[in-house]
């Protein structure tokens, strides 16, 4: 006689919403083996029994969690195999706060994983990374766990939040930190990661404040090149004047990225240009407020963005994306900035 269970593991993790079939079969020299599943909750999957085999179909609902046992008998001999089924939920739904970090400020970073199950601190771990290493000197504050508000009843998913106080990020500041969340399940380790970009000052190491009108460029990779050229700005009297922005390369290596600069002949119009290679296109993917309210012109390797009606550019983040490759460059335009009409 042979008794087989497929998959053969004694613990099986099933993603919520996905189905899994566990087949238990037995061959019998004398006649047909009797095979059945027992220890089933009424809601735990459905069973299809055939001569010599039984198939348990798990639907990937939280109620499917349990330990069914397959029992096979042939004459006077019997075998059994238990399978611990764990249904989990771990979508790629990380939210970080703040959206970007300012060097030189004592700040708290939070990372929230949404719609999680099981909500067990032993299964879920958070890490704040600089590159591939844990950020030294970060202080973990107390974790928080809250039940998500669900549209349908009977699905108690949770959100878990970890906060850290940051150490000094040093000079020059790194381009980004990452929040990494890992779920450790039987024979399965899942990881999601979310970037927390760090503002890179163009002209001064000081963090921005309410009176500063200094633009900041943000890059999404440590090997990024982010350049803003020709953006001539004047500030209101309350803020000190800043020099004309000059290109600033964060790293000489890595993928070439689009460049953002002001179209000097068009007043407050931003131009995004592909920085390398034929067949590359660029498009605007982010602007303060609703991108649809801006006037856009896209022509292959160039894309323009202007305010409707014509006026000063709105304060906030502008992002341009280059394809193929998906490289992005972000430009932060601060408040209290007006176009320099003399330029």
């Amino acid at each position: 006689q042979s008794f087989q269970v497929n998959p053969p593991e004694s613990e099986v993790a099933v993603a919520m919403g996905t189905s899994l079939q566990i087949t238990c079969s037995m061959s019998c020299d004398e006649g047909v083996a009797r095979v059945h599943w027992r220890g089933l909750d009424t809601s735990l999957g459905s069973v299809q029994t055939l001569p010599g085999s039984s198939i348990l179909s798990v639907r990937g609902m939280l109620s499917d969690t349990g330990t069914p046992v397959c029992v096979g008998s042939c004459g006077s001999r019997s075998f059994q195999h238990s399978v611990k089924i764990l249904v989990y939920a771990f979508p790629d739904q990380l939210v970080v706060s703040p959206e970007f970090l300012v060097p030189g400020q004592d700040q708290v970073v939070s990372c929230t994983a949404h719609n999680i199950w099981p909500a067990d601190p032993n299964s879920l771990s958070f890490a704040l990374l600089l590159g591939e290493q844990r950020l030294e000197g970060a202080q973990a504050l107390e974790p928080e766990q809250e039940e998500e508000i669900q549209e349908a009843e009977g699905t108690p998913l949770f959100r878990m939040t970890q906060r850290w106080r940051l150490p000094s990020l040093g000079t020059p500041a790194p381009p980004a930190l990452h929040c990494q969340v890992t779920m450790q399940l039987p024979k399965l380790v899942l990881t999601h990661r979310k970037e927390i970009p760090v503002l890179q000052s163009q002209t001064s190491p000081k963090p921005p404040n309410t009176t500063s009108a200094e633009p900041y460029i943000l890059t999404s990779s440590s090997t990024a090149e982010a350049v803003s050229t020709g953006l001539n700005i004047t500030t209101l009297p309350s803020a000190p004047p800043y020099p004309k922005l000059s290109p600033r390369t964060l790293s000489s290596e890595g993928p070439c990225r689009p460049k953002i600069h002001q179209d000097l002949e068009a007043g407050w119009e931003l131009l995004c240009e592909a920085s390398c290679g034929p067949g590359v296109t660029v498009r605007w993917t982010l602007a303060p407020g609703d991108l649809a309210t801006y006037h856009k012109r896209e022509a292959g390797a160039q894309a323009w963005l202007s305010v409707l009606p014509p006026g000063p550019m709105v304060e906030g983040w502008f992002q341009c994306r280059q394809d193929p490759g998906g490289e992005v460059t972000n430009l932060y335009v601060p408040g209290q900035v007006t176009p320099n009409s003399s330029s």
Epitope: D106, G137, Q139, A140, L141, R163, R165, L166, P167
Partner: antibody, heavy 119, light 107 residues
Framework: EVQLLESGGGLVQPGGSLRLSCAAS????????MHWVRQAPGKGLEWVSY????????NYADSVKGRFTISRDNSKNTLYLQMNSLRAEDTAVYYC????????????WGKGTTVTVSS | DIQMTQSPSSLSASVGDRVTITCRAS??????LAWYQQKPGKAPKLLIY???SLQSGVPSRFSGSGSGTDFTLTISSLQPEDFATYYC?????????FGQGTKVEIK
């Protein structure tokens, strides 16, 4: 000179309340996270609570959660600890302490104020 | 919570002796450790931060070492004013926790 000075301690009956204060001077109070740490007679140090510089983040030791409330008034450079439902095991010297940005050690401590909970 | 275990709980030493106090964390805390000195009736005083950095104004006979889970405070040549209780503290994660203390007494 950087200084922290606690006040408000005293004798209180079990179930009673007290409000401790900590007056800060010599530094930019609002830039620092502040803590309360206590020490029962003849025992070691026990962290009680913290509050961030702006007051937006607070946390408590499990032993005092739901009974103690930390707060601060940055315009008065003062830290507070409201202690309700006091128990005999809360009897201790209470210290306020400042923690340093980026390092998180407690680099400045007050002299302490004594709280005695007894009937 | 991270447990901090100090040893010994007390020790007797003479002026001029080299004294070593150890502190062990129940899990890795990197270098997020401080050492404090406390004299009877007084508030604790910061001696060492970040496991091995000497706090400003603290005599150089005090030194700290270690990272991860095992840490050491060393007083290279014990002075009369060093007789006190010493505490380690981890601040890697909340709740921050202290060791139970090591009392250094005169032999």
């Amino acid at each position: 000179e950087v200084q922290l000075l606690e006040s408000g301690g005293g004798l209180v009956q079990p179930g009673g309340s007290l409000r401790l204060s900590c007056a800060a001077s010599g530094f930019t109070f609002s830039s620092y996270w502040m803590h309360w740490v206590r020490q029962a007679p003849g025992k070691g140090l026990e962290w009680v609570s913290y509050i961030s510089g702006s007051g937006g983040y607070t946390n408590y030791a499990d032993s005092v959660k739901g009974r103690f409330t930390i707060s601060r008034d940055n315009s008065k450079n003062t830290l507070y600890l409201q202690m309700n439902s006091l128990r005999a095991e809360d009897t201790a010297v209470y210290y306020c302490a400042r923690d340093r940005p980026y390092y998180y050690d407690l680099d400045v401590w007050g002299k302490g104020t004594t709280v005695t909970v007894s009937s | 919570d991270i447990q901090m275990t100090q040893s010994p709980s007390s020790l007797s030493a003479s002026v001029g002796d080299r004294v070593t106090i150890t502190c062990r964390a129940s899990q890795s805390i990197s270098s997020s450790l401080a050492w404090y000195q406390q004299k009877p009736g007084k508030a604790p005083k910061l001696l060492i931060y970040a496991a091995s950095s000497l706090q400003s104004g603290v005599p150089s006979r005090f030194s700290g070492s270690g990272s991860g889970t095992d840490f050491t405070l060393t007083i290279s040549s014990l002075q009369p004013e060093d007789f006190a209780t010493y505490y380690c503290q981890q601040y890697k994660s909340y709740p921050v926790t202290f060791g139970q203390g090591t009392k250094v007494e005169i032999k």
